[in-house]
Interface confidence: low
């Protein structure tokens, strides 16, 4: 099974070769290259020197080879970089190559969503309901769930809205939002609203959004 590697958008992934080199072979005898699942070449170290004639343009200038750890560093990660990678090592003979090592890695690229943000899109209407939008941007992969939490002095209610999502055509990052009409007919105390975004690994909470309800005015004194 391939080695699972996780790295973050715009950062660097380490794609290892995990070559034991039990024969203590010098890089100057070997051809080391990495290719992706479409057999496009990321990097080639040919007899100790990096060569670029076979490197695909989308990887050009984005890799660096660490000869101590036999690891390729892929920089400026994009979501589309996710997938399977192979490190292949050949021992160069004048008549051709002998494959002596192969290592498969599976790269997942993550991007942290921004902290959810609550924006009211209407004023409180006669203390009956408020329209809210909660949004979080520039994350990957898409989240599992987005919800709104209403907290009063006496109760906590969770509203699950329909999550709207859009994906950037270039970066492939997701923006997500939910819109809710929150009603509170009988609430007389102040209220705090939170927005929660759940991904496979994390639970992001918005800053609290407070609604201070005006206390009902007591009826004027009745003088008979």
């Amino acid at each position: 099974a391939p080695l699972k590697i996780q790295a973050y958008f715009n950062e660097t992934a380490d794609l290892p070769c995990q070559f034991a080199n039990s024969q203590n072979q010098s890089l100057s005898e070997l051809v080391v290259f990495w290719q992706d699942q479409e057999n496009l070449v990321l990097n080639e170290v040919y007899l100790g020197k990096e060569k670029f004639d076979s490197v695909h343009s989308k990887y050009m200038g984005r890799t660096s080879f660490d000869s101590d750890s036999w690891t390729l560093r892929l920089h400026n990660l994009q979501i589309k970089d996710k997938g399977l990678y192979q490190c292949i090592i050949h021992h160069k003979k004048p008549t051709g190559m002998i494959r002596i090592h192969q290592m498969n890695s599976e790269l997942s690229v993550l991007a942290n969503f921004s902290q959810p943000e609550i924006v009211p899109i209407s004023n409180i209407t006669e203390n009956v309901y408020i329209n809210l939008t909660c949004s979080s941007i520039h994350g990957y992969p898409e989240p599992k769930k987005m919800s709104v939490l209403l907290r009063t002095k006496n109760s906590t209610i969770e509203y699950d809205g329909v999550m709207q999502k859009s994906q950037d055509n270039v970066t492939e990052l997701y923006d997500v939002s939910i819109s809710l009409s929150v009603s509170f007919p009988d609430v007389t105390s102040n209220m705090t609203i939170f927005c929660i975004l759940e991904t496979d690994k994390t639970r992001l909470l918005s800053s609290p959004f407070s609604i201070e309800l005006e206390d009902p005015q007591p009826p004027p004194d009745h003088i008979p």
Partner: antibody
Amino acid sequence: QVQLVQSGAEVKKPGASVKVSCKASGYTFTSYVIHWVRQAPGQGLEWMGYINPYHDVTKYNEKFQGRVTMTRDTSTSTVYMELSSLRSEDTAVYYCARQGDPYSGNYQFTYWGQGTLVTVSS
Amino acid sequence: DIQMTQSPSSLSASVGDRVTITCRASQDVSTEVVWYQQKPGKAPKLLIYSASYRYSGVPSRFSGSGSGTDFTLTISSLQPEDFATYYCQQHYSTPYTFGQGTKLEIK
């Protein structure tokens, strides 16, 4: 059989540009890197750069950087080398040469075009 | 850039002679050296690759040796068709560079 057929001789004035073509046949065009090498009259061989037709990746000798452009047309299996701002010392025979298969460890130039004489003269 | 220095620059010899041409690289190029033969008005032809391996179809009288910085092309018994100019080339790193050539003439 593998063949690289180049365009005909050219006469250019200083400051002009020349575009030499190299049409490949007898093999899968996108599988092999094409290099350009020139030879001034009575002089030795000089490597100018290469183009990888599959990825459209180029690498140029820094001596020619900014003056040379290598392109390819996969529909006609043709590679082009354009040299601009020509001067008299660019008078030379220009060769295209096909590289062997890098994953067989063969980076040498196994097949060559017949050469194209470019004369730069006012 | 790696300099490839060939010697001699010209050489007169007779049919049947044994001839040696040398090529020195300005830095280690492993065995990434090739030798080409060129006749007037023609494109170069590959003779030797990886310093010591004959390309297919090249007669056995041609041999190559060396690694690191010093390389040799030997023609064991010159034939009339061998009179030409010979070039070494390194393809260890770009820019790929050639020796200045050795012109082999009939004595």
